[in-house]
Interface confidence: medium
């Protein structure tokens, strides 16, 4: 229903705490360079204005849209052009073009320093002094680095952060209590970020229909006992929620997400038998829990998929009468039978089915033509299954770091033009798939591996879009989202690349590497590995292993030496010579 004052309506629905958190996230995601204090001031002004509108919905400007109110606030920031360049041009536009312009200027890779966690004592002191400000800083720092982070989910992670600090800051050994718990939250939040970015990419590039298809497949896998009408309703609502969040309408998004959670909990009987535990939780935990609830038990008596979609004499008639509905029911029926498939695979199968019907229903004898369609799915299913087996076997053999290195070599050969930091980031993220998915039961591996890889490759595509240096990458990123992962997997050594000459300075290291944390050390070594591959893209695995083992040995020896500097300056050139010879 229409409300006289949209801002008052959202403030009332969400409550002050969530309202302020969401406005802070929105501002931080739009203007990523502003300090926390600048944003906090704007948030307070917006909140005070919202309270005025709650008191009197007819007060001046209370009838304005949220985009108008928020956009006016952002455009009033001093020195906007100096700090944000052409983003300031957005302020010359009217809504809705102004908001679209802000969205286009969101930076997926802002030049901000990594978010460093303070040491435990300092963190606990500032948390105890002012928990609200502390959590505000957390929301601001995450949101500006991840401008498409799912806002209501970020509130959930802030709540987790808060609970961990409350618990650990009361302990004697704060450090050992905080570190593993906060690392766990950070890891989950980073995965949540790339997954949500993928959803927004799907929405931006291919529209609501594409996202809704994704949602139908995902929901059908999770709720196989819900009927098609129920799944369609949930998918439509979920599409609206995600569209709002991806579009920067964070208050509406959080409000509608809460409504969806409420609906699901009120209709458990027609959705799933697994929802009760989630529904007993408070709002943020409830919505989070529902988003990753375990799959319901599949109905025992499901007929073979062929009955309605291959053997039925009316297939072409049903398809012609309502294409989207018929394909939707196919996707629903196939997905609810296959919780062991990735959503990407299910969408590829639906696409194959659609293409088969398009072709066959125009022929003289359609049933003879589409009769083999299910058999034609086989290679599409085998390809990701083989990918999972090969990669999980490799992960089990090499461990996470070794697996990342294998992926780094592979991807540097596929796209040597891509900058080394981007290749290293991508390989490290792709390599985490092993730890994340390969330890799962067999039937959960494929959906975990492929949907995670797709999300990471989406980030590779977004970064590459900014500076499109590789025709290989451009080709894979230009196609449909569900074809990306198979496209990247199929890439081989880029023959158009002209290798760089071996440069000693690229492989010269100093004693400061010895004091770096393990993660930073790994990144340095992986940077060197990528540069080696760029120098010799056709180097064998054996040659690269020899060089990297020698390099690891060199670091180990010099970092243990009494006079580290001398060791690095004398042994370093010898290492370079040996590397050169090994790769000759």
């Amino acid at each position: 229903e229409a409300h006289k004052s949209e801002i008052a309506h959202r403030y009332n629905d969400l409550g002050e705490q969530h309202f302020k958190g969401l406005v802070l996230i929105a501002f931080s995601q739009y203007l990523q360079k502003c300090s926390y204090d600048e944003h906090a001031k704007l948030v307070q002004e917006v909140t005070d204005f919202a309270k005025t509108c709650v008191a009197d919905e007819s007060a001046a400007n209370c009838d304005k849209s949220l985009h108008t109110l928020f956009g006016d606030k952002l455009c009033a920031i001093p020195n906007l052009r100096e700090n944000y360049g052409e983003l300031a041009d957005c302020c010359t536009k009217q809504e809705p073009e102004r908001n679209e312009c802000f969205l286009q200027h969101k930076d997926d890779n802002p030049s901000l320093p990594p978010f460093e966690r303070p040491e435990a004592e300092a963190m606990c002191t500032s948390f105890k002094e002012n928990p609200t400000t502390f959590m505000g800083h957390y929301l601001h720092e995450v949101a500006r680095r991840h401008p498409y982070f799912y806002a209501p989910e970020l509130l959930y992670y802030a709540e987790q952060y808060n609970e961990i600090l409350t618990q650990c800051c009361a302990e004697a050994d704060k450090e050992s209590c905080l570190t593993p718990k906060l690392d766990g939250v950070k890891e989950k939040a980073l995965v949540s970020s790339v997954r949500q970015r993928m959803k927004c990419s799907s929405m931006q590039k291919f529209g609501e229909r594409a996202f809704k298809a994704w949602a139908v497949a995902r929901l059908s896998q999770t709720f196989p006992n819900a009927d098609f009408a129920e799944i369609t309703k949930l998918a439509t609502d979920l599409t609206k929620v995600n569209k709002e969040c991806c579009h920067g309408d964070l208050l509406e998004c959080a409000d509608d997400r809460a409504e969806l959670a409420k609906y699901m909990c009120e209709n458990q009987a027609t959705i799933s038998s697994k929802l009760q535990t989630c529904c007993d939780k408070p709002l943020l935990k409830k919505a989070h829990c529902l988003s990753e609830v375990e799959h319901d038990t599949m109905p025992a008596d499901l007929p073979a998929i062929a009955a309605d979609f291959v053997e039925d004499q009316e297939v072409c008639k049903n398809y012609a009468e309502a294409k989207d509905v018929f394909l939707g029911t196919f996707l629903y029926e196939y997905s609810r039978r296959h919780p062991d498939y990735s959503v990407s695979l299910l969408l590829r199968l639906a696409k194959k089915y659609e293409a088969t019907l398009e072709k066959c229903c125009a022929e003289a004898n359609p049933p003879a033509c589409y009769g083999t369609v299910l058999a034609e799915f086989q290679p599409l299913v085998e390809e990701p299954k083989n990918l999972v087996k090969t990669n999980c076997d490799l992960y089990e053999k090499l461990g996470e770091y070794g697996f990342q290195n294998a992926i780094l070599v592979r991807y540097t050969q596929k796209a040597p033009q891509v900058s080394t930091p981007t290749l290293v980031e991508a390989a490290r993220n792709l390599g985490r798939v092993g730890t994340k998915c390969c330890t799962l039961p067999e039937d959960q591996r494929l959906p975990c591996v492929e949907d995670y890889l797709s999300a990471i490759l989406n980030r590779v595509c977004l970064l590459h879009e900014k500076t499109p240096v590789s025709e290989h990458v451009t080709k894979c990123c230009s196609g449909s989202l569900v074809e990306r992962r198979p496209c990247f997997s199929a890439l081989t050594v880029d023959e158009t690349y002209v290798p760089k000459e071996f440069k000693a300075e690229t492989f010269t290291f100093h004693s400061d590497i010895c004091t770096l944390p393990e993660k930073e050390k790994q990144i340095k070594k992986q940077t060197a590995l990528a540069e080696l591959v760029k120098h010799k893209p056709k180097a064998t695995a054996e040659q690269l292993k020899t060089v990297m083992d020698d390099f690891a040995q060199f670091l180990d020896t010099c970092c243990k030496a009494a006079d580290k500097d001398t060791c690095f300056s004398t042994e370093g050139p010898n290492l370079v010579t040996r590397c050169k010879d090994a790769l000759a």
Partner: nanobody
Framework: QVQLQESGGGLVQPGNSLRLSCAAS????????MSWVRQAPGKEPEWVSE????????IYADSVKDRFTISRDNAKSTLYLQMNSLKPEDTAVYYC????????SSQGTQVTVSS
């Protein structure tokens, strides 16, 4: 549509100089590191030199070091290669590239060093 148009090649005697230019369009030139690559008849392509986005960092193949200078003008979206003390073995087609790939669309410019 990314386009790279090389020019400035020609026939010169050993010891002389040439200045190659590469006009870039269809992308934000200042965001990319650029390089020169050359291919002599019947030989594999050879990397010559590379320059960072800002122009601050440059590296050269040993075979051209101290004779060739790479530079760029971001305002004009143009890459340059100043070639001094040319030798017969510098004879090749010279290509400017983004990221080090020989683009199918790039024509290159012929440099012939001969007495």
């Amino acid at each position: 549509q990314v386009q790279l148009q090389e020019s400035g090649g020609g026939l010169v005697q050993p010891g002389n100089s040439l200045r190659l230019s590469c006009a870039a369009s269809g992308f934000t030139f200042r965001n990319f590191g650029m390089s020169w690559v050359r291919q002599a008849p019947g030989k594999e392509p050879e990397w010559v030199s590379e320059i960072s986005q800002s122009g601050e960092n440059t590296i050269y193949a040993d075979s051209v070091k101290d004779r060739f200078t790479i530079s760029r003008d971001n305002a004009k979206s143009t890459l340059y290669l100043q070639m001094n003390s040319l030798k017969p073995e510098d004879t090749a087609v010279y290509y400017c590239t983004i990221g080090g790939s020989l683009s199918r669309s790039s024509q290159g410019t012929q440099v012939t060093v001969s007495s």
